[in-house]
């Protein structure tokens, strides 16, 4: 008996071939001997089966001695043995229809679980293997689960169902809803304008939800909500914003926030959360602000940074084109009685400059000038 695997919702062609290469009488029946379809001369005739409106054949193939049964919009319950009667012979074809679906939705938040469920006909014992877009293989029976979805899991999952040495392939498009970056850090000199960007790692036609940026300033004892906003069909509208600082927000995606001035009291860490309509859970992106200030007070030249810096970052003070006068893994450095000239305060990571502030030290009879 020939075995054919089909996919739920798909169309399948069950073949039946006669030795004579011409149009002759044929019939297709199911295992209960109920006629599905056949021919009367050149006309297609249909029987009283449940397949009536979904069964068809191909007239142009009859003249070649081929009498296919074509079943559209396959259902699991179409799984059966189909019998083709032609030339006093009977050809049996066993059709097994499988379905593979993702739990609830194919748009899932980062960190959530994906469950794939296999629908199969009674009496079948299929095995399933799925390959994620990043090449990770998972195997299972009726259900397959992947916990803690990552951004790289977005894309087409290819699942192969094996039964009776035959296979059928399913492709499921999964979208992991997340920000492009889990965390970002912005380095700014005091007084500079700060731009925070929160690009999404996915595109959907309609995006609706609400969000908030909570800020924990290094100098503050508790965190504070800086801004709340709504998102409707990719349009951003601000609901509430603090007076200090007075953030501005872009009206279009990607989510974009502007802080008019980088000040030491704003240095710290923020957490932008985005709750999407019809989704449980929230998207998160951490953002950090490091602020640098270089000052000269009487005979003391000081450079300070505020905000979340790694212990391996180096803070240096150096006179332009000269070796660093002072270089420490600390958040403040200073030079007493600095020589006149252009001084540079540098925050660097393994030799790469992250932030730089220049201050001009004038001869002792003058006051300092900050460019």
């Amino acid at each position: 008996k020939k075995v054919v695997l089909g996919k739920k919702g798909d169309t399948v062609e069950l073949t039946c071939t006669a030795s004579q290469k011409k149009s002759i009488q044929f019939h297709w029946k199911n295992s209960n001997q109920i006629k599905i379809l056949g021919n009367q001369g050149s006309f297609l005739t249909k029987g009283p089966s449940k397949l009536n409106d979904r069964a068809d054949s191909r007239r142009s193939l009859w003249d070649q001695g081929n009498f296919p049964l074509i079943i559209k919009n396959l259902k699991i319950e179409d799984s059966d043995t189909y019998i083709c009667e032609v030339e006093d012979q009977k050809e049996e074809v066993q059709l097994l229809v499988f379905g593979l679906t993702a739990n609830s939705d194919t748009h899932l938040l980062q960190g959530q679980s994906l469950t794939l469920t296999l629908e199969s006909p009674p009496g079948s014992s299929p095995s399933v293997q799925c390959r994620s877009p990043r090449g990770k293989n998972i195997q299972g029976g009726k259900t397959l689960s992947v916990s803690q979805l990552e951004l790289q899991d977005s894309g087409t999952w290819t699942c192969t169902v094996l039964q009776n040495q035959k296979k059928v392939e399913f492709k499921i498009d999964i979208v992991v809803l997340a920000f492009q970056k889990a965390s970002s850090i912005v380095y700014k000199k005091e007084g500079e304008q700060v731009e925070f960007s929160f690009p999404l790692a996915f595109t959907v036609e309609k995006l609706t939800g609400s969000g908030e940026l909570w800020w924990q300033a290094e100098r503050a004892s508790s965190s504070k909500s800086w801004i709340t906003f709504d998102l409707k069909n990719k349009e951003v509208s601000v609901k509430r914003v603090t007076q200090d600082p007075k953030l501005q927000m872009g009206k279009k995606l990607p989510l974009h926030l502007t802080l008019p001035q980088a000040l030491p009291q704003y240095a710290g860490s923020g957490n932008l959360t985005l709750a999407l309509e019809a989704k449980t859970g929230k998207l998160h992106q951490e953002v950090n602000l490091v602020v640098m200030r270089a000052t000269q007070l009487q005979k003391n030249l000081t450079c300070e940074v505020w905000g979340p810096t790694s212990p391996k970052l180096m803070l240096s003070l150096k006179l332009e084109n000269k070796e660093a006068k002072v270089s420490k893994r600390e958040k403040a450095v200073w030079v007493l009685n600095p020589e006149a000239g252009m001084w540079q305060c540098l925050l660097s990571d393994s030799g790469q400059v992250l932030l730089e502030s220049n201050i001009k030290v004038l001869p002792t009879w003058s006051t300092p000038v900050q460019p």
Epitope: V12, R59, I70
Partner: antibody, heavy 115, light 107 residues
């Protein structure tokens, strides 16, 4: 919704080979036959040939010696090659889905053969 | 090959008119016939299949009839969007063949 998107070279010189590809999305690929049809400017429709997912083909005898139809099931795509083209092969070429009748069509590709 | 002869090759009509197009198959094709509508610069669209079955989404003013050799497409009340070219096609045997087309023009 089933969609057929086709592409290929639009300008050929006589004796060259016409090459077109059609990508199918949004529906079943396996249970149907996938056809190529052409229509010379201001004229009627001519069926070129067809293929199914397993590579079984049927061609118009008038073109059979010059036609190659192939299928790539991994991409849900099928292709047409027509060799030794002449000015008489200038036409709008369509891909279409067929069981007995053509229910979904590609947007068409105008192929001009000119020296 | 099965020859499909469509008549007339063109017809002038007004909005609201009843329009009839015929297609003759030689030899006969039982009911293995379809009708298509084609507008300039567009691909044909299936209107009627199996001689008389209306394709999903096609307005009910279109109807088909006939069996064997003679087939008819009727537009009961012509609408402005119906001015187009109409083709018949047989699916009885290879090669699949089309009629020469009937252009429905505005009077």
């Amino acid at each position: 919704q089933v969609q057929l998107q086709q592409w290929g070279a639009g300008l050929l010189k006589p004796s060259e080979t016409l090459s077109l590809t059609c990508a199918v999305s949004g529906g079943s690929f396996s249970g149907y036959y996938w056809s190529w049809i052409r229509q010379p400017p201001g004229k009627g429709l001519e069926w070129i040939g067809e293929i199914n997912h397993s590579g079984s083909t049927n061609c118009n005898p008038s073109l059979k010696s010059r036609v190659t139809i192939s299928v790539d099931t991994s991409k849900n795509q099928f292709s047409l090659k027509l060799s030794s083209v002449t000015a008489a092969d200038t036409a709008m070429y369509y891909c279409a889905r067929v069981l007995n009748f053509f229910d979904y069509w590609g947007q068409g590709t105008l192929v001009t053969v000119s020296s | 090959d099965i020859q499909m002869t469509q008549t007339p090759s063109s017809v002038s009509a007004s909005v609201g008119d009843r329009v009839t197009i015929t297609c003759r198959a030689s030899p006969g094709i039982s009911n293995w016939l379809a009708w298509y509508q084609q507008k300039p610069g567009k691909a044909p669209e299936l209107l009627i299949y199996a001689a008389s079955s209306l394709q999903s989404g096609v307005p009910s003013r279109f109807s088909g009839s006939g069996s064997g050799t003679d087939f008819t497409l009727t537009i009961s009340s012509l609408q402005p969007e119906d001015f187009a070219t109409y083709f018949c096609q047989q699916a009885n045997s290879f090669p699949l063949t089309f009629g020469g087309g009937t252009k429905v023009e505005s009077k």
